[in-house]
């Protein structure tokens, strides 16, 4: 393979590194309120954490960067900690003819890496 | 649609946003010298520079997080420039019976975006 | 807790009205939507409508369309279902229900209203 | 209007028991699906959504499958109160519906 293997324990502690929080969000933050009606709140998961050197890395250009990261740092980013795949959620908003309830599949985080 | 259209031009000024930049890497580099063979020198591309609100935005999901970024700065992290699409390479390793030319699909970014 | 608890039941002659309520307690009221749903003696469940309780948007189903009408009161977290012109196949229980949600979970029920239609 | 088919309509069966009870939408719902729980002059409960999401409260010998048009609740072992009545729903489109009910009955 490519790649080491990804590590998976966080090296700086509990909470630290890449995973998988819930934030609130109302309508009104999303600037939504004009054409969603329902929910009115989200439970919103999102990725965040730090992405130390192979925690969680998505594949092997992860890999690759977060060694030429710890090699050129000025020049090369750290991974960073991004969704590896969403949770379809449904709301409610206005239509022309009335109410409609849609899928959005791209807008909740199921899983988090480092990317 | 659930979100405002991404937007592509650079507030940050040129070359400061998400983009595409090649680095120079050898086998050395990558600590991949004693497995594979050729090329000693590989053109990685990779995603850097800044996610400034709805640049080149992923999807949905990206929308939100520099929404809520803005909101909660403390809470929720801004979207960061990863890679949307990848470009194979073939790498030329050595094997048990000898040389073997490899692909590698998740090597080399070929375009980037916000997530 | 999160609850809904529902008004006592009615009995109600063929052609009147009736209004049933639900308050809400325990959550943002004007954060979800509220459904009604029927359950007639011995039969299954038959949605009746939706109402979106910060905005009073609504959506009936075809059958009752013009004969119901569903409503909001955010300031007792209230919402009503008024079901006119009653003949004796409306005979049921009637339930409010929260939702659906992001996850189109209908999650929390009230205790149910059982309305009696009869001459 | 999709139509939700569930089947069977009744089913006996005793305490350990593995019992599945299947819903057919008319058309795709994605994974759209919830299953409640009733019993006898009580309001419905949820068990499942999502297709196969646990609500909170809920024993994990319910489990609930598929995507699409197929859908399945299990209960792996069944205990004495969990002789009731299972209603399938779905909330991909208005308006929305409900199966017709499978009532699990004591053997």
């Known amino acids: 393979s490519a790649h080491a293997h990804p590590r998976d324990s966080c090296p700086l502690g509990p909470g630290r590194c890449c995973h998988l929080e819930t934030v609130q969000a109302t309508l009104e933050d999303l600037g939504w309120s004009d054409w969603v009606l329902s929910p009115r709140q989200l439970q919103l998961s999102m990725c965040v954490g730090e992405c130390p050197h192979l925690y969680r890395s998505a594949n092997t250009h992860a890999q690759i960067k977060a060694r030429l990261h710890g090699l050129q740092p000025d020049k090369v980013p750290a991974p960073c900690c991004v969704p590896s795949s969403y949770t379809p959620v449904v709301l409610m908003h206005r239509t022309d003819s009335g109410v409609s309830l849609q899928t959005y599949d791209d807008l909740v985080a199921r899983g988090c890496h480092c990317a | 649609s659930a979100h405002a259209h991404p937007r592509d031009s650079c507030p940050l000024g040129p070359g400061r946003c998400c983009h595409l930049e090649t680095v120079q890497a050898t086998l050395e580099d990558l600590g991949w010298s004693d497995w594979v063979l050729s090329p000693r020198q590989l053109q990685l591309s990779m995603c850097v520079g800044e996610c400034p609100h709805l640049y080149r935005s992923a999807n949905t999901h990206a929308q939100i997080k520099a929404r809520l970024h803005g909101l909660q700065p403390d809470k929720v992290p801004a979207p960061c420039c990863v890679p949307s699409s990848y470009t194979p390479v073939v790498l030329m390793h050595r094997t048990d019976s000898g040389v073997s030319l490899q692909t590698y699909d998740d090597l080399v970014a070929r375009g980037c975006h916000c997530a | 807790q999160v609850q809904l608890v529902q008004s006592g039941a009615e009995v109600k002659k063929p052609g009147a009205s009736v209004k049933v309520s639900c308050k809400a307690s325990?959550?943002?009221?004007?954060?979800?939507?509220i459904n009604w749903v029927r359950q007639a003696p011995g039969q299954g469940l038959e949605w009746m409508g939706w109402?979106?309780?910060?905005?009073?948007?609504?959506n009936y189903a075809q059958k009752l369309q013009g004969r119901v009408t569903m409503t909001t009161d955010t300031s007792t977290s209230t919402a009503y279902m008024e079901l006119r012109s009653l003949r004796s196949d409306d005979t049921a229980v009637y339930y409010c229900?929260?939702?659906?949600?992001?996850?189109?979970?209908?999650?929390?029920w009230g205790q149910g209203t059982m309305v009696t239609v009869s001459s | 209007d999709i139509q939700m088919t569930q089947s069977p309509s009744s089913v006996s069966a005793s305490v350990g028991d593995r019992v599945t009870i299947t819903c057919r939408a008319s058309q795709g719902i994605s994974s759209w699906l919830a299953w409640y729980q009733q019993k006898p002059g009580k309001a419905p409960k949820l068990l499942i959504y999502?297709?196969?999401s646990l609500q909170s409260g809920v024993p994990s010998r319910f489990s609930g499958s598929g995507s699409g048009t197929d859908f399945t609740l299990t209960i792996s072992s069944l205990q004495p109160e969990d002789f009731a009545t299972y209603y399938c729903?779905?909330?991909?489109?208005?308006?929305?519906?409900f199966g017709g009910g499978t009532k699990v009955e004591i053997k």
């Open positions: 999502a297709a196969s």
């Open positions: 109402i979106d309780a910060y905005s009073g948007s609504t």
């Open positions: 325990g959550y943002t009221f004007t954060s979800y939507g």
């Open positions: 729903q779905q909330a991909n489109s208005f308006p929305i519906t």
């Open positions: 229900a929260r939702g659906p949600g992001q996850y189109a979970d209908v999650d929390v």
